[in-house]
Structures are given as structure tokens and as C-alpha cells.
């Protein structure tokens, strides 16, 4: 039951992970314009991954796309790959992880391969988690560098005498995000991890002896066999009937259609 | 058509108040912010502050803060404005002006002229 | 608070010339967000209100005439009447929208022969 509640869990909180990581990746401010030397602007700039904004005091908002790839700082493209991967291997965890689900039968998926698949859409979510929290890193760590850069020449001095601010942008709504769910996807994986573990069914301790005509073999019959998943050995003892694939937390009743909720 | 009609003249007392309004038709009421100005006789242009229809919310020129109060009224696309303290340099003609794109001022009411005399 | 400062104060033109009027701001008013100068022009005749001309520096409000134009970046404006009429005598504002409080020139006075 625990088992099925980690691995639920994980799932819905890697959901909610790369839900946020798509968000993110789509919002315009990840980037906008600080007010703190200019608190009384009636024109508010803020720039995302894709296109930049102007917000008039008048409520009008204009959105420009960045209409070129060549022209791209290196750093916005590594931010837009990252965020993308991210997404890619977001989704296909997500995938895995719904056919790993225990609370799911299809056909007759052994316990090894559900084990397997949980590890393998666990691993997906915290590199998914990963990436995002890098890309976002990145493109923070951009700004923070762009920051102090203009900070250093703010006042550019025209003829002497006139005085023009210059724009500096601070951290948006859109890297709060990133983070956040950036931060659920990796625990929404490690979760996942976690519940693989308890998938993953014991080598039994007895033996099926089987007498030959012949008398002269004892042949060793496992109950299951243990998968693969680089962890310790299971906290949760399984007993395995027929050699089959269900175990014990699997005889209880499950509706008839599979749900998917 | 866009219009913005503004209240009919008035003439006050010095230290009385007094609140004018802005009609807008033709038009969504809440989609557009509205702005005041004053213009003194033979003067030119002064800005008061704004108020956003949609949000109910203000903002003034630091200099007519406290004596300007500016609301509005979603059910009757009015906005308004309440001039308190006033004296002889409060003597002007206030405008209220529809802001469009650009941060500009496209459609203006008549004017509503204000005498301030004892 | 940016100063707007136009000149010249007045202007006395026979119709049919053209006609040249400068705005300075004592900070700059365009936007890096979008490349635009949040300038507007506007023309107010006697005992009416102001009608707007020109927004974002350049961009003419639809319905007036093509002979008024629109100039400038950052802090030096131009509106430029390239044949005058007898319907354009008014008194010519130009109005900082870039930040608040929005401020106003003092305004360019045209008169006609």
C-alpha cells in the first residue's frame, strides 16, 4: 500500500512539476524591467524565452517574438534547450509512469517490468527537474550579471546635460516557477525511485523440489525474480505464487476498466 | 461615436470643494483609462492624475495629491473628480481624456470650467 | 518630474508654407522595450479642447491630415506642417508619456497671416 501511495504520489507531484516546467517555459516574464530606479514609469518591459513585452500605462500590451536564431545570445539558446529537454523528457517519464503505475493493470505486466519502468520514468523526472532548474539558473544568473553590469554605467550622460535611464531588468514571475516546479519534478522523481524499490519483487527463500523418475535432480524453482534497480534489498518481504508476476498487495480487488485517474 | 461629457461649469467659494464628472459613451467604460488635466486661462496644460475604471484604482501627480480625489462608477461609465481646498490659482478648465495606445490622450471631454471666487 | 521644454513660443507663417516646431525632454523618452519614444503631439484651437495628432514620436492618430508629421528620438522632437492652413492655427503641445507625472511643453503658438 505504501508502495502505491509513493508511487501515486510521485507521479501526481512530477505532474504538477512539469505542468509548472511547461508554464514556465511559455510565460513572458522572465525578465522584468526594475522599477526601483524608475518607479514611476507609464511603459513596463518584461522579456520571456520567446518574445518581449511593453505594458502602457494605458493598458495596451505589445508583444514582439524574437524572430531569429542566429541573433540570439548563446545563453538564451542554452536556456530555451534546457527548458525544452526538460519538457521532452518530462513527458516521456510521464508516459512510462503511467503504465508503471500499480494501481493500473495492463495485461499481464510483471512487477519486474513495472519496477523497471518506474525506475526509468523516476530517473526521466530528475533529470526533467534538473534541467529546468539549470536553465533557469542560467538565465537568473544572466541577469544578475546584466544587472550589475548596467548598474556599473547607469547614467549615460548625452551632451552632458541630458539624462537618459537605462533599462535594467530583474528576476521575473517565470524563474519562481521554473524553480518550484523544476524542484517538484526531481522529487516527484526521486519518489518515483524510491517506490521502484518496493516494486521490485524478492527472490524467495524456498524451494519447489521436483522428483524425477530418474531421482537424480533437485530442480531450484524461483518464486519471482529480482529486478535489476541498483537498490538494497526490499523492506517489504513479497511472497510470489506459481512463479507469476502478481504479488501479495496485488490481491486485492481492482475495477474492471483501468483507471487512469 | 466616442464621448466624453463633462459636467457644466461651476463657480465655488474658496475652501470649498467641488466634484465634476466625465460621462463616457460609445465606448466599453472599463477597457480604457481615464485622465485629468488642468489648463488655466491663456496657460498651458497640467496633468492631475488618472483612474483606472476597471480596478477603481488612482494615480495622482504628487503635486494635486491629498486634494484631488478621483473615482468612477462602472454602472453609469462615469468617472469623477473631487477638488478640495480650493483657492484662485484652482480657477481652470479640467479636462478628462480617454488614454489609448501609446499613452495617448485620443478622445477629451469639453472641459468643465471652474471659478474660484469669494 | 521630465521638463518639456518647445520652442519657438509663437509662430507667424502665410498659409501654404512649410512649418518646423521643436520639442526637448530633459530625459530621454524612448523605451529599449520596443524601440519607440513615448512623445505625443497635440494641437488645441481657441475655446476647444486638445485633439491629438501624433503618438509614439511618429505614428499620425488616424483622421489627421498627412501634412502633419512627426520626428525625433530620445530627447529632440520635431512636428513638422509641410503646407500650412488656415484651420491649423492653434496653440501645439508636446507631452511626455513615458513616465509619470505626464508633463506637458508649454506649447508652440501659431499663428497665421
Known amino acids: 500500500m505504501a508502495v502505491t501511495a509513493c508511487q501515486g504520489l510521485g507521479f501526481v507531484v512530477s505532474l504538477i512539476g512539469i505542468a509548472g516546467i511547461i508554464a514556465a517555459t511559455c510565460m513572458d516574464q522572465w525578465s522584468t524591467q526594475d522599477l526601483y530606479n524608475n518607479p514611476v514609469t507609464a511603459v513596463f518591459n518584461y522579456q520571456g524565452l520567446w518574445r518581449s513585452c511593453v505594458r502602457e500605462s494605458s493598458g495596451f500590451t505589445e508583444c514582439r517574438g524574437y524572430f531569429t536564431l542566429l541573433g540570439l545570445p548563446a545563453m538564451l539558446q542554452a536556456v530555451r534547450a534546457l527548458m525544452i529537454v526538460g519538457i521532452v523528457l518530462g513527458a516521456i517519464g510521464l508516459l512510462v509512469s503511467i503504465f508503471a503505475l500499480k494501481c493500473i493493470r495492463i495485461g499481464s505486466m510483471e512487477d519486474s517490468a513495472k519496477a523497471n519502468m518506474t525506475l526509468t520514468s523516476g530517473i526521466m523526472f530528475i533529470v526533467s527537474g534538473l534541467c529546468a532548474i539549470a536553465g533557469v539558473s542560467v538565465f537568473a544568473n544572466m541577469l544578475v550579471t546584466n544587472f550589475w553590469m548596467s548598474t556599473a554605467n547607469m547614467y549615460t550622460g548625452m551632451g552632458g546635460m541630458v539624462q537618459t535611464v537605462q533599462t535594467r531588468y530583474t528576476f521575473g514571475a517565470a524563474l519562481f516557477v521554473g524553480w518550484v516546479a523544476g524542484g517538484l519534478t526531481l522529487i516527484g522523481g526521486v519518489m518515483m525511485c524510491i517506490a521502484c524499490r518496493g516494486l521490485a519483487p524478492e527472490e524467495t527463500n524456498y524451494k519447489a523440489v521436483s522428483y524425477h523418475a530418474s531421482g537424480h535432480s533437485v530442480a531450484y524453482k524461483p518464486g519471482g525474480f529480482k529486478a535489476s534497480t541498483g537498490f538494497g534489498s526490499n523492506t517489504k518481504n513479497k511472497k510470489t505464487y506459481d512463479g507469476g508476476a502478481h504479488t501479495e498487495d496485488e490481491l486485492q480487488s481492482y475495477p474492471s476498466k483501468h483507471d487512469y485517474v | 461615436e466616442v464621448q466624453l461629457q463633462e459636467s457644466g461649469p461651476e463657480l465655488v467659494k474658496p475652501g470649498a470643494s467641488v466634484k465634476m464628472s466625465c460621462k463616457a459613451s460609445g465606448y466599453t467604460f472599463t477597457n480604457y483609462i481615464i485622465h485629468w488635466v488642468k489648463q488655466k486661462p491663456g496657460q498651458g496644460l497640467e496633468w492631475i492624475g488618472y483612474?483606472?475604471?476597471?480596478?477603481?484604482?488612482?494615480k495622482y501627480n504628487e503635486k494635486f495629491k491629498g486634494r484631488a480625489t478621483l473615482t468612477s462608477d462602472k454602472s453609469s461609465s462615469t468617472a469623477y473628480m473631487e477638488f478640495s481646498s480650493l483657492t484662485s490659482e484652482d480657477s481652470a478648465v479640467y479636462y478628462c481624456?480617454?488614454?489609448?495606445?501609446?499613452?495617448?490622450?485620443?478622445?477629451w471631454g469639453q472641459g468643465t470650467s471652474v471659478t474660484v471666487s469669494s | 518630474d521630465i521638463v518639456m521644454t518647445q520652442s519657438p513660443s509663437s509662430l507667424t507663417v502665410t498659409a501654404g508654407e512649410k512649418v518646423t516646431m521643436n520639442c526637448k525632454s530633459s530625459?530621454?523618452?524612448?523605451?529599449?522595450?520596443?524601440?519607440?519614444?513615448?512623445l505625443t503631439w497635440y494641437q488645441q484651437k481657441p475655446g476647444q479642447p486638445p485633439k491629438l495628432l501624433i503618438y509614439?514620436?511618429?505614428t499620425r492618430e488616424s483622421g489627421v491630415p498627412d501634412r502633419f508629421t512627426g520626428s525625433g528620438s530620445g530627447t529632440d522632437f520635431t512636428l513638422t506642417i509641410s503646407s500650412v492652413q488656415a484651420e491649423d492655427l492653434a496653440v501645439y503641445y508636446c507631452?511626455?508619456?513615458?513616465?509619470?507625472?505626464?508633463?506637458f511643453g508649454s506649447g508652440t503658438k501659431l499663428e497665421i497671416k
Open positions: 509614439w514620436a511618429s
Open positions: 483612474i483606472n475604471p476597471y480596478t477603481d484604482g488612482p
Open positions: 530625459q530621454s523618452l524612448l523605451n529599449s522595450g520596443n524601440q519607440k519614444n513615448y
Open positions: 507631452q511626455n508619456d513615458y513616465s509619470f507625472p505626464f508633463t
Open positions: 481624456a480617454r488614454l489609448n495606445r501609446g499613452n495617448a490622450m485620443d478622445y
